[in-house]
């Protein structure tokens, strides 16, 4: 039985040309996280494996930052970046947990910045 | 020319362990992960595990764990796998593949020519 | 685990003819799927990677398709060489990489 439970950043903003961090929180289970990967729509953009570490996609490499922690930094943000984000854990033996971060990318500078995740 | 040259077939018994060589030319070894498949008399694929010939770092599928050893050798451009406490069910061909730059992920581009492993009593 | 399911297991065709080949992932793997060649007594051949691109020296008359949870492998017209078993494989989640069941293509 599937018994944990994603927290994410929820809905955040962050200026063009700015960074930001996507972070999800997996807890409320004793599943061991194998997997996480990081995903904006139907593209892979970074994976973070157990065994073998962080992998981040070509087509991102030069944008995308792993970490903090099993989190994801997005860097050089332009407006074609806003939209949905999802963390997928891949846990056994519990299965597969998904988080949705939305993020809206401000041409202006007055980007109210969503409240900070904090993990314990 | 790239190639994955396997060593030859072995017949073993019950409560044995194996040992089978994959050793890799015509490319940058330690660029690429390696991985390990193995496939029963008449039946699918099964994936066993990778190996990224950089660092020594190891992945094993669940079935295998602490039954399974994947190392390699740089200096000869070999990786190794080796299966313990051997069963009829593990009668199989081993294949080792190499998979996509230790930087990202990809298929299974090249091949050994397989290994056959018979368990027998 | 993701689990790969193919369909059918066999399929009798004629050469010359249209062969679609089928397969489903229980989760999205995104495009991040390969199809493979196996013929009895060889190692398997890579012949699509990234769901639709075709690898190196394999024939026009291969193509895939399909994206998250779908994927299909197309022969356009059947050659005798092409008589084999064709596997699909996702590669984004491991552990374990998974790959489907199997596909044999045979002479009708």
């Known amino acids: 039985m599937m018994t944990g439970t994603i927290e994410t950043t929820g809905n955040i903003s962050a200026e063009k040309g700015g960074s930001i961090i996507l972070q999800c929180h997996l807890s409320s289970t004793t599943a061991q996280v194998t997997q996480v990967n990081w995903e904006q729509q139907d593209q892979l953009l970074a994976i973070c494996n157990a065994d073998l570490g962080w992998h981040i996609s070509p087509s991102f490499k030069d944008r995308v930052a792993p970490g903090p922690g099993l989190g994801l930094t997005l860097q050089s943000l332009t407006v074609n970046d806003t939209g949905e984000y999802f963390c997928i854990y891949h846990t056994y033996p519990d299965g597969t947990y998904t988080g949705r971060i939305f993020l809206e990318v401000l041409e202006s500078s007055v980007a109210e910045h969503g409240a900070r995740f904090q993990i314990p | 020319q790239v190639q994955l040259v396997q060593s030859g077939a072995e017949v073993k018994k019950p409560g044995a362990s194996v040992k089978v060589s994959c050793k890799a030319s015509g490319y940058t070894f330690p660029a690429y992960y390696m991985h390990w498949v193995r496939q029963a008399p008449g039946q699918g694929l099964e994936w066993m595990g990778i190996?990224?010939?950089?660092?020594?770092?190891?992945s094993y599928a669940q079935k295998f764990q602490g039954r399974v050893t994947m190392t390699r050798d740089t200096s000869t451009s070999t990786v190794y796998m080796e299966l313990s406490s051997l069963r009829s069910e593990d009668t199989a061909v081993y294949y080792c593949?190499?998979?996509?730059?230790?930087?990202?992920?990809?298929?299974?581009?090249?091949w050994g020519q397989g290994t056959m492993v018979t368990v027998s009593s | 685990e993701i689990v790969m399911t193919q369909s059918p297991a066999t399929l009798s065709v004629s050469p010359g003819e249209r062969a679609t080949l089928s397969c489903r992932a229980s989760q999205s793997v995104s495009s991040n799927l390969a199809w493979y060649q196996q013929k009895p007594g060889q190692a398997p051949r890579l012949l699509i990677y990234g769901a639709s691109t075709r690898a190196t020296g394999i024939p026009a008359r291969f193509s895939g398709s399909g994206s998250g949870t779908e994927f299909t492998l197309t022969i356009s017209s059947l050659q005798s060489e092409d008589f084999a078993v064709y596997y699909c494989q996702q590669y984004v989640v491991w552990p374990p990489l998974t790959f489907g069941g199997g596909t044999k293509v045979e002479i009708k």
């Open positions: 190996i990224n010939p950089s660092l020594g770092l190891t």
């Open positions: 593949a190499r998979g996509g730059r230790t930087t990202w992920i990809g298929a299974f581009d090249i």
